[in-house]
């Protein structure tokens, strides 16, 4: 059948999901497309336990997640409800700050150096994390 039981090569399994951690940086939209091209999505954090898992793997580095408010309200890329879901913003965040001088506000969420979340300019080249549910992940190793 089409159901998968293993994560792809170079992905990390955790609680029935597979995670992939970048080592380079991209703008949020490019990171989003990268994950989608891998049949995945930018990471959606649904619990404190998942937050700690991701935080452990990324370390103290700004890293994009699958949360944005580019069309108004905050939305998770997989449709998970934002209002009732897990949140871990830094104090006073999100603030849609316009003072950066880059035009517009701040519409994309990232993990900061302490793991808490901040909204920032989506064009900034941050690292990113992809996630896919285990039964959607390919178990076939890529032929390099």
């Amino acid at each position: 059948g089409s159901e998968r039981t293993c994560c792809p090569v170079n992905w990390v399994e955790h609680e029935r999901s597979c995670y992939w951690f970048s080592r380079s940086g991209k703008a949020w939209a490019d990171a989003d497309n990268y994950c989608r091209l891998e049949d995945a999505h930018l990471v959606v954090v649904t619990s404190w336990e998942e937050q700690k898992f991701v935080q452990h793997h990324i370390g103290p580095v700004n890293t994009w997640m699958g949360l944005h408010d580019q069309n108004g309200p905050w939305k998770w890329v997989d449709g998970t409800d934002y209002e009732t879901g897990f949140k871990n913003w830094r104090p006073e965040q999100p603030d849609d700050w316009y003072g950066h001088g880059l035009g517009g506000g701040e519409d994309c969420a990232h993990f900061t150096d302490d793991g808490r979340w901040n909204d920032d300019v989506c064009q900034r080249p941050y690292r990113w994390v992809c996630e896919t549910e285990l039964d959607k992940a390919s178990q076939e190793p890529p032929l390099l």
Epitope: A29, D30, L37, D39, P141, P142, L143
Partner: antibody
């Protein structure tokens, strides 16, 4: 040996439709994103569309969005491009291309290309 | 969209000459750049990926360099089979975009 073989090209009138196919062999097809790239006569290369390995996500150039649909059948190792509302400016050789170097953190370069199939849109 | 500009559009060389082709991106693409060779009537063939990595089976006379917005492809000593058209392509963002092509012709 990786092989990509396109078919389905031909002469079609403006406003008409055509479906291109690309038969793949020599690699684990479902593990790789695939793209269509075209080349108008005497012109350069233009990326048209891409699809993820399992087919869940698709991407298009603005010039074909809403008219072309990329799809794949992993059980048959085949890539497709459904082209509707064709225009004269769609006249080109259409190549299917395999996303290469997956260990890189990029959206793609292409390590293998088919030989191409010619699509001519003319009345 | 990211524009890719190749220069020159054509270059004339003799066998044994050193040829350098330049590709400029309209915005930073890190090192996410590939170079292709296309002979008349044939499909493109990848030469260089990630700006400077030589594809397996490609002669070592081909080399690539650069990062950010400025990249070069160098053929250290042109051989008869190298007379062809060369393209750069950025792989950082959708839509993927190619430079317009540089034709290397016999002088």
């Amino acid at each position: 040996e990786v092989k990509l073989l396109e078919s389905g090209g031909g002469l079609v009138q403006p406003g008409g439709s055509l479906r291109l196919s690309c038969a793949a062999s020599g690699f684990t097809f479902s593990s790789y994103a695939m793209s269509w790239v075209r080349q108008a006569p005497g012109k350069g290369l233009e990326w048209v569309s891409a699809i993820s390995g399992r087919g869940g996500n698709t991407f298009y150039a603005d010039s074909v969005k809403g008219r072309f649909t990329i799809s794949r059948d992993n059980s048959k190792n085949t890539l497709f491009l459904q082209m509707n509302s064709l225009r004269a400016e769609d006249t080109a050789v259409y190549y299917c291309a395999k996303r290469g170097f997956r260990f890189l953190e990029w959206l793609g370069g292409f390590d293998y290309w088919g030989q191409g199939t010619l699509v001519t849109v003319s009345s | 969209d990211i524009q890719m500009t190749l220069s020159p559009s054509s270059v004339y060389a003799s066998v044994g000459d050193r040829v350098t082709i330049t590709c400029r991106a309209s915005q930073d693409i890190s090192n996410w750049l590939a170079w292709y060779q296309q002979r008349p009537g044939k499909a493109p063939k990848v030469l260089i990926y990630a700006a400077s990595s030589l594809q397996s089976g490609v002669p070592s006379r081909f080399s690539g360099s650069g990062s950010g917005t400025d990249f070069t492809l160098t053929i250290s000593s042109v051989q008869p089979e190298d007379f062809a058209t060369y393209y750069c392509q950025q792989g950082n963002s959708f839509p993927l975009t190619f430079g317009g092509g540089t034709k290397v012709d016999i002088k």
